[in-house]
């Protein structure tokens, strides 16, 4: 009886179960009754990352410097090239096909997580007791100055964008 289903890492063709090509190799010719599947390695600029019956290997991704991209990990015959973004930029999508500059956190917001090549800056509002008076991709919210530790008093209350203003204590009798 000709098979209707094949084992793992096989495929059915012309009533025969043929071996799939291993990762890093492409199909040249299907197996026959007397011969095994013929596979050939992908060339240096190509890859296939699964057991397959592909007749063409996939081209490695090109990390285009004009789009701010650079190689994070060189591709092999079994893996694609992984691109990342140059300093100060991050990927616009999971597939990292282009880059944009990191976002800066506006005054009143601080950096919760510094951007990487693949993720943007994460900002958070400065909570009570903290402020940020700059637009920055690196600066966290800073705590208000503690006037008491300087033997001073608060002359002007702080906000999420401004520090407190300290002044001398009134020397009243």
């Amino acid at each position: 009886e000709p098979p209707t289903a094949c084992r793992e890492k096989q495929y059915l063709i012309n009533s025969q179960c043929c071996s799939l090509c291993q990762p890093g190799q492409k199909l040249v010719s299907d197996c026959t009754e007397f011969t095994e599947t013929e596979c050939l390695p992908c060339s240096e600029s190509e890859f296939l990352d699964t057991w397959n019956r592909e007749t063409r290997c996939h081209q490695h991704k090109y990390c285009d410097p004009n789009l701010g991209l650079q190689v994070q990990q060189k591709g092999t015959s079994e893996t694609d090239t992984i691109c990342t973004c140059e300093e100060g930029l991050h990927c616009t999508s999971e597939s990292c096909e282009s880059c944009v500059p990191h976002r800066s956190c506006l005054p009143g917001f601080g950096v919760k997580q510094i951007a990487t090549g693949v993720s943007d800056t994460i900002c958070e509002p400065c909570p009570v007791g903290f402020f940020s008076n700059v637009s920055s991709a690196f600066e966290k919210c800073r705590p208000w100055t503690s006037c008491e530790t300087k033997d001073l008093v608060v002359q002007q209350a702080g906000t999420n964008k401004t520090d407190v203003v300290c002044g001398p204590q009134d020397r009243q009798r």
Epitope: E1, F34, E38
Partner: antibody
Framework: EVQLVESGGGLVQPGGSLRLSCAAS????????MSWVRQAPGKGLEWVGF??????????EYAASVKGRFTISRDNSKNTLYLQMNSLRAEDTAVYYC??????????????WGQGTLVTVSS | DIQMTQSPSSLSASVGDRVTITCRAS??????LNWYQQKPGKAPKLLIY???RRDSGVPSRFSGSGSGTDYTLTISSLQPEDFATYFC?????????FGGGTKVEIK
């Protein structure tokens, strides 16, 4: 011991018929493809045809030079392979070998041979 | 059909000699190449299958190599019992075809 023994060879006139037999022993006959190979006197080897195993419905394949004239069959209950030769020609004169065809897709080969039986086609 | 061309058709050698027989296919046979030994009045005997795999019981002095269309049978040190005719056979595509044979004779 794995063994193949041919019989049935002899002298036959052009246009005549002959049936060769090959008795197999020492292995599970129905599991194997079985083949006939011939060798004209002082010449090289020529594949004649084969019959597939039970799993492949005992279907047959033939060389172009004998297709339509020769028929390969088998009787698995008797562990015997046959070659029915009709419309014989002078060029069919040869020693006929029965051979077991073995292996996997990483190389098939004739791994067991009989001693051969001579067929002479002459008037 | 795939044509198999063996060379030389015959050779003379002495015991202990290294002997090389070549077989050329008319197209790529992807290593599906077998070698047989035949002595006068006897049936052929399988020596090597799939280019380089020795059949059980075949002495290690017999070795096979090659790829694509060109294949070689080597006898590293010829023994008296090795004087015989050697045939190659392709097993890639029907009809199976044999080389014309190489007769190894005593010098």
């Amino acid at each position: 011991e794995v063994q193949l023994v041919e019989s049935g060879g002899g002298l036959v006139q052009p246009g005549g018929s002959l049936r060769l037999s090959c008795a197999a022993s020492g292995f599970t006959f129905s599991d194997y493809y079985m083949s006939w190979v011939r060798q004209a006197p002082g010449k090289g080897l020529e594949w004649v045809g084969f019959i597939r195993n039970k799993a492949n419905a005992y279907t047959t394949e033939y060389a172009a030079s004998v297709k339509g004239r020769f028929t390969i069959s088998r009787d698995n209950s008797k562990n015997t392979l046959y070659l029915q030769m009709n419309s014989l020609r002078a060029e069919d004169t040869a020693v006929y070998y029965c051979a077991r065809y073995g292996g996997l897709r990483q190389g098939w080969y004739f791994d067991v041979w009989g001693q051969g039986t001579l067929v002479t086609v002459s008037s | 059909d795939i044509q198999m061309t063996q060379s030389p058709s015959s050779l003379s050698a002495s015991v202990g000699d290294r002997v090389t027989i070549t077989c050329r296919a008319s197209q790529d046979i992807r290593n599906y190449l077998n070698w047989y030994q035949q002595k006068p009045g006897k049936a052929p005997k399988l020596l090597i299958y799939y280019t380089s795999r020795r059949d059980s019981g075949v002495p290690s002095r017999f070795s096979g190599s090659g790829s694509g269309t060109d294949y070689t049978l080597t006898i590293s040190s010829l023994q008296p019992e090795d004087f015989a005719t050697y045939f190659c056979q392709q097993g890639k595509t029907l009809p199976w075809t044999f080389g014309g044979g190489t007769k190894v004779e005593i010098k």
